[in-house]
Structures are given as C-alpha cells and as structure tokens.
C-alpha cells in the first residue's frame, strides 16, 4: 500500500517546509486516495474488459452513486461553501458502503483497497472538523446499507465486475469535483 500523506520521502527530505495548512492537508489526502483508486482501476481494467464496455450506462442506472449537481453549490455558478461542504461529506459517507463492497474484489491490490477505505474515513473526519453545520449532514441508514451490500454481492460475475469499475470511476469523479471545490473554501 502507498505511504499515507505526510509520511512520504519528500516530506522527510524537506524538514524546513512550512507545516501544511488544513486545506493543503485535505488536498493531499484526496490525492492519496486518488492514487489508490488509480492502482485499483489498473487491476480492474487488466482483469476484465469493463473499462471499454458499452453496457456501462445500463449498469450505472441501477447504482445510486453520489454525484455533484448544480444545486449542491460546488460549482462556480452558485458556489456555496457550507452547502457544498455538506454535499461532499454526505457523498463520502454514502460512498462508504460501496468502498466496503470493494474490499473482497481485488487479488493483488487487497491492501490498496483497504487503504482507500481507511483514507476516506480519515478524509471525512478532516472535513467534519471544517464543517460548521454538522446537523445538515445525513448519515446513511446502516440497515439500508447492509441490504444494499448483500444485493451487490449477490450479483453475477459480470455485474460485479461492472459494479467495481463504476464505483471506482464515480468515486474518482466525485473526489476530483470535491478537490476543486474545497480549494475555493
């Protein structure tokens, strides 16, 4: 698994560098997760032809993966720091069940999948410290998540491979949008 942010050789070699700000730490955490996603996607794409599949739109419609929309206040037009932050945290919390699903989906990158999951939990904690309005953040219902996980794991092999591909791709897109929005805060 990759070294967690703040512990890479670059940081060790540059002790004179100013400590990271809260925003920079969050930025670095997201990049670390994105690197992990890239490694997982490499294995997924090498193992199956899902990355080129034209049937992904059909499968995507059956998954309720978090997405950024204009109303979420994360885009330049209508940017709203608090609304956007709530959306990012809520979205990450919703992704957690899908990251749990990924845990048994990798052979050579099992550690990497765990690192992505744990790093996302850390990112959520960072962001919750930043949020002023924690009451607006809705936590997914554990019972609903458990039944969703069971349903996903009961799919046939082709659908499981497709689901894995779509989760990784959607999570990457969500993090990219989040990263851009968070820089403006």
């Amino acid at each position: 698994a990759p070294v967690p942010p703040g512990e890479d050789s670059k940081d060790v070699a540059a002790p004179h560098r100013q400590p990271l700000t809260s925003s920079e730490r969050i930025d670095k955490q997201i990049r670390y997760i994105l690197d992990g996603i890239s490694a997982l996607r490499k294995e997924t794409c090498n193992k199956s032809n899902m990355c080129e599949s034209s049937k992904e739109a059909l499968a995507e419609n059956n998954l309720n993966l978090p997405k950024m929309a204009e109303k979420d206040g994360c885009f330049q037009s209508g940017f709203n720091e608090e609304t956007c932050l709530v959306k990012i945290i809520t979205g990450l919390l919703e992704f957690e069940v899908y990251l749990e699903y990924l845990q048994n989906r990798f052979e050579s990158s099992e550690e990497q999948a765990r690192a992505v999951q744990m790093s996302t939990k850390v990112l959520i904690q960072f962001l919750q410290k930043k949020a002023k309005n924690l009451d607006a953040i809705t936590t997914p219902d554990p019972t609903t998540n458990a039944s969703l996980l069971t349903k996903l794991q009961a799919q046939n092999q082709w659908l499981q491979d497709m689901t894995t591909h779509l989760i990784l791709r959607s999570f990457k897109e969500f993090l990219q949008s989040s990263l851009r929005a968070l820089r403006q805060m």
Epitope: M68, F75, R169, R183, Q184
Partner: antibody, heavy 116, light 107 residues
C-alpha cells in the same frame, strides 16, 4: 499519447459568433476537465472556461454572457461558442486539458481574426 | 478574481546563467500554482504544478518554490532552448488566472 486537435473558422466579422471544436485522441475524455484559453497577439493568456463530461461548466465572469462551452461525449469532443465578437476577441484560441492542477496538454491553437 | 503579477516583465541572460522569475498572487493561493513555458507560435508547455512539482519530462534545472502569495521559478543553468516566455497560473479559484508573462531573452 494524448493529443488535442482543434478547428474552426479563422476569420469573422464583428457581431458574428466564433465557433471552435476540440477533439481528444488517445486518452480518456471522461476523467478530465476541458478548457478554452485565448491569447491576443503579443499579449498574455486568458482562461475562457471549462467543461466536464457531465456537461457542468465554469466560465470566466468577464465573458460569461457571451460564452457557451458544450460537450459531445460520443465523439470525444468539446466546443466553444463566443457570440457578438468584436476586434477585441482577435486571438489565438487554445483548448487544453486540466486534471487536478495545471493545463498539461494543449491543442495546437487556432488564430481567430475579427475584422470588418 | 485573483490577480497574478510577475516580475520582471523581461530579462536578458546568457547561457549558463541562473535565472529567477517571481510571481505574486493578490491573495493566498496555498501551493496551487503552475508555471508554463511558451515559445513563439507554439502552445504553452507545463513545467511545474503545485508550486514545486516538476512535470514529467521537464529537465531538473527547472525548479519552483513558494506558498501563499509569493512564488519563484528558477532555472539553475540557462540552456539555449530555455529562451522563451514564462507564465505563472493559479488554480485555487475561478476564474483561473495567469501572470502577464516574463520574456527571457539572450544577452
């Protein structure tokens, strides 16, 4: 090797609409943000706006009322339209790719001249 | 909008010289700054991102530093192919903005 190829009309009259298209070859369209940037002759760079595959856009407020950036995911292309052009819009227009940081890949540029 | 101001606007230097270009942001941008090189009639080329990370394939004589509002691009030993115009650009917020450019000419 990812390449951006751009094309469009090079000579326009005042009040016409500038229209340029940029095609992405050899890389993923979905995972990046795609921008238009312009450079008037002998001057610096000005960011016009960007689009994501989903169609979400961000525009430079100074041009927003005249700019439309759209996407055609089936063709791996995105386009720029700039309405009511004047001589001040004469520039080299570039398309470029942005992931998390810089504009790492650029099109070859298209010189657009506005003259009556 | 965040204003980016480069200095100097132009400079003359010889092959082998150490060259430093500075860029100042009108407000703090953390380390969300990129540097580009542009040669006549060509598209800009990315050199550095995140203030100090070298883009792949860029020679190690190029380096970047800074955080907050003040940034520097250094060319440790100027080569003939380095004579060009250099731009800084912030990507903390929208709209993305560039410095006005620094032209590096042969002395």
């Amino acid at each position: 090797q990812v390449q951006l190829q751009q094309w469009g009309a090079g000579l326009l009259k005042p009040s016409e609409t500038l229209s340029l298209t940029c095609a992405i070859y050899g890389g993923s369209f979905r995972e990046y943000y795609w921008s238009w940037i312009r450079q008037p002759p002998g001057k610096g760079l000005e960011w016009i706006g960007e689009i994501f595959h989903s169609g979400s856009t961000n525009y430079n407020p100074s041009l927003k009322s005249r700019v439309t950036i759209s996407v055609d995911t089936s063709k791996n292309q995105f386009s720029l339209k700039l309405s009511s052009v004047t001589a001040a819009d004469t520039a080299v227009y570039y398309c470029a790719r942005e992931e998390l940081d810089d504009f790492d890949i650029w099109g070859q540029g298209t010189m657009v001249t506005v003259s009556s | 909008d965040i204003q980016m101001t480069q200095s100097p606007s132009s400079l003359s230097a010889s092959v082998g010289d150490r060259v430093t270009i500075t860029c100042r942001a009108s407000q703090g941008i953390s380390s969300w700054l990129a540097w580009y090189q542009q040669k006549p009639e060509k598209a800009p080329k990315s050199l550095i991102y995140a203030a100090s990370s070298l883009q792949s394939g860029v020679p190690s004589r190029f380096s970047g530093s800074g955080s907050g509002t003040d940034f520097t691009l250094t060319i440790s030993s100027l080569q003939p192919e380095d004579f060009a115009t250099y731009y800084c650009q912030q990507y903390k917020s929208y709209p993305r903005t560039f410095g006005q450019g620094t032209k590096v000419e042969i002395k």
